[in-house]
Structures are given as C-alpha cells and as structure tokens.
C-alpha cells in the first residue's frame, strides 16, 4: 500500500503525458487523479514507465473500479494489461472483438499466459459460442488455440466457424478433439465439389469414420501418407486393400516405409497376405492364405 502524501506544488497532473516519466512512486500516487488516468489510458502506452510506476497506475485503477474495469478502459490498457492477474480479468466483461484484439496484440509473440487464457475464456463465455470472427482472431494470434480446448468446449464451435480454421491450427489436436471437429467440418464443406472438398476436409480427417474414408476412396483424392498416418486406427482397420489403394493413389508406395507404425501396422495384420501382395510393395504380416478370419466382436454381438 502506497502512503497517502500530498502532491507537491506544481506537480499535479493535468493530463497523462511524458512529464510523468520521472515521477517517484509516491508522486504518481499523490499527483495523478484516477479518473484522469481512466479517461487517458491510451496515452500511458506511449510513455515507457518503469514497472514500479505501472504498479502505481494499476493500483489507482483498482481503487477506482473495485468491481472490475469498464471496457472503455480495458480497450486502452496496452502494456498495463501485462500487469493484470487472472483474478483481475475475471471481473471484466469484454464484449468487443476490438478490445480482445488490442489486448492480444500486447501479448503478441509470447506464449499464451494465464492472463490471456482467462481473457479469452471470459470473452468466449460472454459471446456464448466461438463464432467465426473470434476464431479467426484467436488462431491468428495463437495457431494452437483450437487444440487447447476440451472436446466439450469445442462442441460450442458452430460449423460456420470452421471456415476460419487453417491446417496448422489443428497440428496439436488429439483424436478426441478431431472427433468433435470433423462432423462440423463435414457439414461446413458439404456443398463443395470433390477435389475442393478434400482440400478443405483433409486436416480434419483424424476424426473421420470408416464409411467416410470408404466414400473418399471412390473419389480419386490421392491422400498423402502424412494424412493417412493421422487417421483413426479403428476407422482404417475395416478398409480393404483395394480401398486403401484407391484412397492413397500414387502415394500407396509410402505404406512400405510405415509398415511398422500405426495405423498401417494394425491394418496389415487385418488383411489377407494375398491381397497385400497385389500391391507389389513387399508388405508382410498379413493373414496367411487358407486361414479363416473370425470377427469375435461380431460373434459376441450376435450371442
């Protein structure tokens, strides 16, 4: 707590300007009116105050707005935002995308801090859903943002927002997240023609079920191995050799290099060796000829 001392004669701040730069801690406390500070927050950003001085300015705003800052102040916090705690931010009601952008700009280039995470959470909850403009903004600043959300949080993403998602935004998503995003993407891109559809849906395919992969295999899509390796194992296993060959097109040769890795390894174990041999890639580990394959899961379901 800063001691309450009288402002020295002639030092009372009439506006927030560079004359304050060398004010001591107690002088700032005594000579800068909190209401003046609130109305001229945008000027603070142009003055490279020390961190001690910023602490005093924050303290003044905290006293003026104990229930949380109004958005008119929040939008102009600039680098004073870096002084805010998640507890401070939880008191805010941020509704404007411009305010969100202004504060994310301050944190640009940094990893997502607890302050930023809290700000985004408050903003998205206030909007009720993760709309396209918000998603556009967030992924522009934090490409990994989408994959930091839980499947439950992702369920609030409307299909229309999927248009804002870039392939790199999904790099760190796990299968559970892609399971939620894939149906939304399928819905969002449903009116596109074959090749355009595949380009858009490709990065979401880690959430695709078997029947959709079968359908894609009929469309000459030439899926690359990197995409194939990200598919759900349980979705790949039921595919026939012919379907995988059609799905991968010229990329089918890449299976040899991946034969020890999932999902290729598990898929090979489910295929007849005869069928694998038709690929001419030397893939080994299929079911020997003459062996009967019993699907025990099917048998259990029938009984």
């Amino acid at each position: 707590e800063v001691e309450k001392t009288a402002c020295p004669s002639g030092k009372k701040a009439r506006e927030i300007d560079e004359s304050l730069i060398f004010y001591k801690k107690w002088e700032l406390e005594a000579c800068v009116d909190a209401a003046l500070l609130a109305t001229q927050m945008d000027r603070v950003n142009a003055i490279p105050f020390t961190y001690e001085q910023l602490d005093v300015l924050k303290h003044k705003l905290d006293e003026l707005y104990p229930q949380g800052y109004p958005e008119s102040v929040i939008q102009h916090l600039g680098y004073l935002f870096l002084k805010m705690s998640p507890e401070d931010i939880r008191k805010w009601n941020v509704t404007s995308l411009e305010t969100l952008k202004a504060l994310l700009e301050v944190n640009k280039g940094h990893e997502m801090s607890p302050q930023v995470a809290t700000l985004i959470d408050r903003f998205v909850k206030g909007r009720g859903q993760l709309d396209k403009d918000t998603l556009d903004t967030l992924t522009a600043f934090y490409p990994g943002y989408l994959c930091s959300l839980s499947p439950e949080e992702l369920s609030s993403v409307p299909p229309s927002s999927i248009w804002a998602v870039r392939p790199q935004d999904l790099d760190t998503c796990d299968p559970r997240q892609l399971d939620v995003l894939y149906p939304k993407a399928r819905l969002a891109f449903q009116n596109m023609n074959g090749s355009e559809y595949f380009v858009k849906i490709q990065s979401f395919l880690g959430g695709a079920p078997t029947e959709d992969l079968k359908a894609l295999s009929q469309q000459n899509v030439s899926m690359d191995l990197a995409t194939f390796m990200k598919l759900r194992t349980d979705a790949v296993l039921p595919l026939t050799v012919a379907e995988v060959q059609k799905l991968l097109g010229p990329h089918v040769e890449g299976l040899k290099a991946e034969e020890r890795h999932r999902p290729v390894r598990d898929w090979i174990l489910r295929q007849r060796q005869d069928d694998l041999d038709t690929l001419g890639l030397g893939l080994q580990g299929g079911i020997p000829n003459g062996y009967l394959v019993l699907d025990l899961s099917m048998q259990e379901a029938l009984s």
């Epitope: 560079e18 060398f22 950003n45 490279p48 020390t50 961190y51 001690e52 680098y79 700009e105 301050v106």
Partner: antibody, heavy 120, light 107 residues
Framework: QVQLVQSGGGLVKPGGSLRLSCAAS????????MSWIRQAPGKGLEWVSY????????YYADSVKGRFTISRDNAKNSLYLQMNSLRAEDTAVYYC?????????????WGQGTLVTVSS | EIVMTQSPATLSLSPGERATLSCRAS??????LAWYQQKPGQAPRLLIY???NRATGIPARFSGSGSGTDFTLTISSLEPEDFAVYYC?????????FGGGTKVEIK
Amino acid sequence: QVQLVQSGGGLVKPGGSLRLSCAASGFTFSDYYMSWIRQAPGKGLEWVSYISSSGSTIYYADSVKGRFTISRDNAKNSLYLQMNSLRAEDTAVYYCARDGYRTHNWFDPWGQGTLVTVSS
Amino acid sequence: EIVMTQSPATLSLSPGERATLSCRASQSIGNSLAWYQQKPGQAPRLLIYDVSNRATGIPARFSGSGSGTDFTLTISSLEPEDFAVYYCQHRYSWPLTFGGGTKVEIK
C-alpha cells in the same frame, strides 16, 4: 529495417568537448524515447542519459550531470549527445539505443557504438 | 539505486553444454528484467525481456526464469556463436542499471 547509425567519436583532451550523433531509420523516430549508454574499456554498461519522444523530458546519470546534454531533432530523425568538460573516466564506447514503445520497454536496437577517448 | 549482481564472472564451457547464468537484484524487481548478449566489437542486443520472453529472432535454446530478486538465463546447448558476454538489466525504477556481465568462453 530498424537501424541506428552513430558518428562523432574520437580522441579529445581532458576538459575538451565532443558531440555524438545517432541517425535513426526504419521506424517512426518521434514515437520513441531514446538513450545513451556507455561502456568503459573492459567494463560493463552504464546508462548515461535519456530523452522523451518530444525532447521535453530528460534524465542524466549523476556521473555526467551538468556536463553532458542530450537532445534530438525529430524532423531529422537524429539523436545527439553534447559532451563538455570531458574527463579521463568518460573514456568509453558510447551507444545510442531505442527504448520500447507500446508493447515492451527495453533497449532495442542499439547503435554500433562510437569510441570516445579522453587523454592528454 | 538497484544494484544488479551477475555470477559467475566467467563461465568456461564447451559447445553443446548447458550454460546457466545468474543475476541477482538488490531489491525485488518483480518481472522487470532483460538479458542482453554482446559479442566482441559489437553492440549489445536484446535477448530476453520481462524475465522469460524471447526477443524477435532469438533461438529457443535461450530461456529465462526467476522473479523477485533472483533470475537465471539458460542456454540449453551452446552453439559456437553463443560465446559472448551476457548482461542483465532491470526496469523496475529509475535509474535503470545493468549487471556487471558474465563472460561465456570456450573451454
């Protein structure tokens, strides 16, 4: 790109004067506070002087107060350090540096440095 | 004024080794700390600011940590170009001061 190019160093006798210049390019010079920082041979860094974006607010280290004058000409994108009554202990490489603005306030970038040698 | 003390004065290491540099402030400075790198005959350049944020173009092998009075700069695996002098600086209050520097030299 953002650049600070210095000139004006040299050899001067004790009690003499010297003027250092720092020409800025690649950024809006008039938005930024600027500093002079010096480094005596084989020693660390010492913050010498500071000037606000408009030039109206100035700071000097106690070691140079009353002898050095910092100034700027925003129309010419230039920063200056007028050094009078020079002493042997002022011998150093002098750097101009831009202060941060709006996002983070640290010295970045720095000029290439100019050597000032005070010796009889 | 706040006095910044760096240790060790010299660190002798081989390329590939991990370097740990220390900086201590004479009073608490929160997260108001930056690190600069200076190579012989060159100006210092900003490396890390606000304790842990890498400046533009600085490789990920450089990282900063600490708060209050004790701070650390870590170079996870030294590259030949990392052998230089490193300075810490605070921006907590006026005047701004630098540490005396730590020289990282090849063993």
